[in-house]
Amino acid sequence: PGPPPGPPRVSPDPRAELDSTVLLTRSLLADTRQLAAQLRDKFPADGDHNLDSLPTLAMSAGALGALQLPGVLTRLRADLLSYLRHVQWLRRAGGSSLKTLEPELGTLQARLDRLLRRLQLLMSRLALPQPPPDPPAPPLAPPSSAWGGIRAAHAILGGLHLTLDWAVRGLLLLKTRL
C-alpha cells in the first residue's frame, strides 16, 4: 500500500453541510418571496393559481415529526428538480411580460441548481439512497397567452415558496437527528 498519505484535504462535515443547506434554502425562500411579491405588484393575482405539472406539496408542517432523513431529502430533491424545470420553462416560454422579472428569475434558477447540488452532496456524504430522478416528463406546453404565462408564474413561485418553507422546517428537524 505504500506510505500513509498526508493529512486529508478538508471538506465540510455533513452537519456543517446541513447548516449551510438550511442557510441556502432560507436565502432561496427569501428570493422567492420577494420575486412573488414583485410579480403580484406588476400583475395582481386574481385568486389562487394552479399548474397541473407542479408537484403536490410534500408534507404538512404537523406531519414533519414522523419523517426520516432519506425520505425528506429524496422528496425535496425530486420536488426542487421539478421546480427548476418549471423556472427554466418560464424563462424560456413565459413571454415578454415576464422579462420584467429578469435578472431575478435567472438568479433564482442558479440558486435552485446550487441547492440541488448541495442536497445531493449531503446524501452522498451520509450514504443515503439516491433513487434516480423520475423519467423526464413530457415537455411543458408554452402558455396559451401572455396572461397564461403570468398565471403560471404565480403558480410556480407560490408553490416553490411553500416547498422551500417546508424544506427549511424539515432540514432543521433533521439536524437534531444527525
Epitope: L126, L128, P133
Partner: antibody
Framework: EVQLLESGGGLVQPGGSLRLSCAAS????????MHWVRQAPGKGLEWVAV????????YYADSVKGRFTISRDNSKNTLYLQMNSLRAEDTAVYYC???????WGQGTLVTVSS | QSVLTQPPSASGTPGQRVTISCSGS?????????VHWYQQLPGTAPKLLIY???ERPSGVPDRFSGSKSGTSASLAISGLRSEDEADYYC???????????FGGGTKLTVL
C-alpha cells in the same frame, strides 16, 4: 487531523475468510457514510460496499454480493468488512473511505492464493 | 470495463494545460448525479481533488478545475507541474448500484 487506519489484511487461501477493520479518528465518524474501495495490483479503483451514517442502509457491488458484509460500530468509531468465500480475483489493496468519499485510509493488502 | 470512461493516458510539459475527460451515461452523470475527481500519487491512497463537478476542497490549488456537461465531465490542470504526475479517477453515483462508480483512471505523465 483525519485518520483512517485499516487492519486485518493478509494472505488467505481461496474459499477462506478475513475480517478487515478501519479505525477512524479526527472527524465525527457517526455523521459520515463509509465505503470500502479496492484496487487490484496495477489496476484501477473498484467500489466494494457502502454503509450509511447510522448503519441503516448497506449496498454492495455485484462482484461481492452475498460474500462480503459491511458493518460499523459508531461507539467505537470503527468500520468492518467481513469477507467470506474469498477468490483469487479479490486480491487487492482494500481502502476504507468516508463520505463522498472525501477521506481515505492508506489501505490494507489482501492476497488470496493457494 | 468501467461504467465511466476515461482515456488511459495523458501527458503534457511543465506549464501546459491538460484536460482529462470522463464519459458516463444517462443512468449516472446524465441523470444529474455529480462527478468527483481523485488524484492518486504513486504508492499512495487516492485523495479527493474536485467534488460536486467543480468544487475544490480546501488545500487544493486553483490550477485544478472541474466541469460537467450532459453525460460527461472533465478535469483541467493548468500550469502543469512535475508533482502532478499521478493517476486521476472520476467517480459518480450510480443509482442501479446505490454506490459510486469509478472511471478506469488516467495516467498523467509530465514530460
Amino acid at each position: 487531523e483525519v485518520q483512517l487506519l485499516e487492519s486485518g489484511g493478509g494472505l488467505v487461501q481461496p474459499g477462506g475468510s478475513l475480517r478487515l477493520s478501519c479505525a477512524a479518528s479526527g472527524f465525527t465518524f457517526s455523521s459520515y457514510g463509509m465505503h470500502w474501495v479496492r484496487q487490484a495490483p496495477g489496476k484501477g479503483l473498484e467500489w466494494v460496499a457502502v454503509i450509511s451514517y447510522d448503519g441503516s442502509y448497506k449496498y454492495y457491488a455485484d462482484s461481492v454480493k452475498g460474500r462480503f458484509t459491511i458493518s460499523r460500530d459508531n461507539s467505537k468509531n470503527t468500520l468492518y468488512l467481513q469477507m467470506n468465500s474469498l477468490r483469487a480475483e479479490d486480491t487487492a489493496v482494500y481502502y476504507c473511505a468516508a463520505g463522498v468519499p472525501d477521506y481515505w485510509g492508506q489501505g490494507t493488502l489482501v492476497t488470496v492464493s493457494s | 470495463q468501467s461504467v465511466l470512461t476515461q482515456p488511459p493516458s495523458a501527458s503534457g510539459t511543465p506549464g501546459q494545460r491538460v484536460t482529462i475527460s470522463c464519459s458516463g451515461s444517462s443512468s449516472n452523470i446524465g441523470s444529474g448525479y455529480d462527478v468527483h475527481w481523485y488524484q492518486q500519487l504513486p504508492g499512495t491512497a487516492p485523495k479527493l481533488l474536485i467534488y460536486s463537478n467543480e468544487e475544490r476542497p480546501s488545500g487544493v490549488p486553483d490550477r485544478f478545475s472541474g466541469s460537467k456537461s450532459g453525460t460527461s465531465a472533465s478535469l483541467a490542470i493548468s500550469g502543469l507541474r512535475s508533482e502532478d504526475e499521478a493517476d486521476y479517477y472520476c467517480a459518480a453515483w450510480d443509482p442501479s448500484l446505490s454506490g459510486p462508480v469509478f472511471g478506469g483512471g488516467t495516467k498523467l505523465t509530465v514530460l
